[in-house]
């Protein structure tokens, strides 16, 4: 399992660091989640050939996974701190149902899947403290989420494997884009 934020998982050359700023803490939290995703993807790719599949675009269209778009204000052109922060929090909230779906999808990395889910909840809390305009953040409807979860779990084995792969990959991409945008805030 990755080292929890606050401890260092990398080879740090300078051991005496100043206390982390809120931005650095968020950065570290995202990295921790990304480390967890990498471990989960390793198991997924070893278990099935989904990571090389050419049919993923087909399956991706049926999943409404959050993505960054120009209008979200997270890219350099048209960068807007508040709009972007709202998009990041909203996107993470939307990913939660997919992270719930992942919980029973791993054998050797069950703890890791739980750690990614719990760490994402913590990240959302960090970011909500940072946001000024919490009213603009739309929380997904629990009923809709419940039926989506049922639908995903009812898929055949191949589609479930593909869904797992796509969720992990999309979540990684979303976090990478978020991390870059958050540094500018």
């Amino acid at each position: 399992a990755p080292v929890p934020p606050g401890e260092d998982s990398k080879d740090v050359a300078a051991p005496h660091r100043q206390p982390l700023t809120s931005s650095e803490r968020i950065d570290k939290q995202i990295r921790y989640i990304l480390d967890g995703i990498s471990a989960l993807r390793k198991e997924t790719c070893n278990k099935s050939n989904m990571c090389e599949s050419s049919k993923e675009a087909l399956a991706e269209n049926n999943l409404n996974l959050p993505k960054m778009a120009e209008k979200d204000g997270c890219f350099q052109s048209g960068f807007n701190e508040e709009t972007c922060l709202v998009k990041i929090i909203t996107g993470l909230l939307e990913f939660e149902v997919y992270l719930e779906y992942l919980q029973n999808r791993f054998e050797s990395s069950e703890e890791q899947a739980r750690a990614v889910q719990m760490s994402t909840k913590v990240l959302i809390q960090f970011l909500q403290k940072k946001a000024k305009n919490l009213d603009a953040i739309t929380t997904p409807d629990p009923t809709t989420n419940a039926s989506l979860l049922t639908k995903l779990q009812a898929q055949n084995q191949w589609l479930q494997d593909m869904t797992t792969h796509l969720i992990l990959r999309s979540f990684k991409e979303f976090l990478q884009s978020s991390l870059r945008a958050l540094r500018q805030m």
Partner: antibody, heavy 116, light 107 residues
Framework: QVQLQQWGAGLLKPSETLSLTCAIY????????WSWIRQPPGKGLEWIGE???????NYNPSLKSRVNISVDTSKNQFSLKLTSVTAADTAVYYC??????????WGQGTMVTVSS | DIQMTQSPSSLSASVGDRVTITCRAS??????LAWYQQKPEKAPKSLIY???SLQSGVPSRFSGSGSGTDFTLTISSLQPEDFATYYC?????????FGQGTKVEIK
């Protein structure tokens, strides 16, 4: 072992368009940001811009009006176009990979000379 | 744009010397700073990221420190292969910017 291989015209006349391509071998294209960086002879490094697999770009404002970076995901390649070149654009041009932090993998560099 | 200023521009040192290069950002960049080594006719090579984290495969004689606006790259005991030009780079915001470089020459 991930490698970046780059190519393109090395000699241009003023007002022409610089065109370079970088191919990624042995690694995932989707999961990184891909940049172009240049270095005029005897000078320091200047970041030109970057692209993500989705096609979203970030450019250096000092060059933005003349730069276009595009991607061809089917070939694991990305390209740089710089229009209306002048002698000031003479430099070694590098492609590089950036994940979360530094540029950890670089192409071999292409010397581009602009001369009439 | 965030300006990155390195000092000194060049220095002469002997094998075994302790060498320190500093980099100053025109505004706070937290610890979002990288250091590179470049040898003549070669592409730069990443040494350190996040101000103090060593890139894998880089010898432990290289170390980085600093946060905010002031950063340092230290080579604890200079080796013959360390004679090169060193650059710092910030990745807090766009555009990504580099220091002007510090050339480490043989005394």
């Amino acid at each position: 072992q991930v490698q970046l291989q780059q190519w393109g015209a090395g000699l241009l006349k003023p007002s022409e368009t610089l065109s370079l391509t970088c191919a990624i071998y042995g690694g995932s294209f989707r999961e990184y940001y891909w940049s172009w960086i240049r270095q005029p002879p005897g000078k320091g490094l200047e970041w030109i811009g970057e692209i993500f697999h989705s096609g979203s770009t970030n450019y250096n404002p000092s060059l933005k009006s003349r730069v276009n970076i595009s991607v061809d995901t089917s070939k694991n390649q990305f390209s740089l176009k710089l229009t209306s070149v002048t002698a000031a654009d003479t430099a070694v041009y590098y492609c590089a990979r950036e994940e979360l932090d530094d540029f950890d993998i670089w192409g071999q560099g292409t010397m581009v000379t602009v001369s009439s | 744009d965030i300006q990155m200023t390195q000092s000194p521009s060049s220095l002469s040192a002997s094998v075994g010397d302790r060498v320190t290069i500093t980099c100053r950002a025109s505004q706070g960049i937290s610890s979002w700073l990288a250091w590179y080594q470049q040898k003549p006719e070669k592409a730069p090579k990443s040494l350190i990221y996040a101000a103090s984290s060593l890139q894998s495969g880089v010898p432990s004689r290289f170390s980085g420190s600093g946060s905010g606006t002031d950063f340092t790259l230290t080579i604890s005991s200079l080796q013959p292969e360390d004679f090169a030009t060193y650059y710092c780079q910030q990745y807090k915001s766009y555009p990504r910017t580099f220091g002007q470089g510090t050339k480490v020459e043989i005394k």
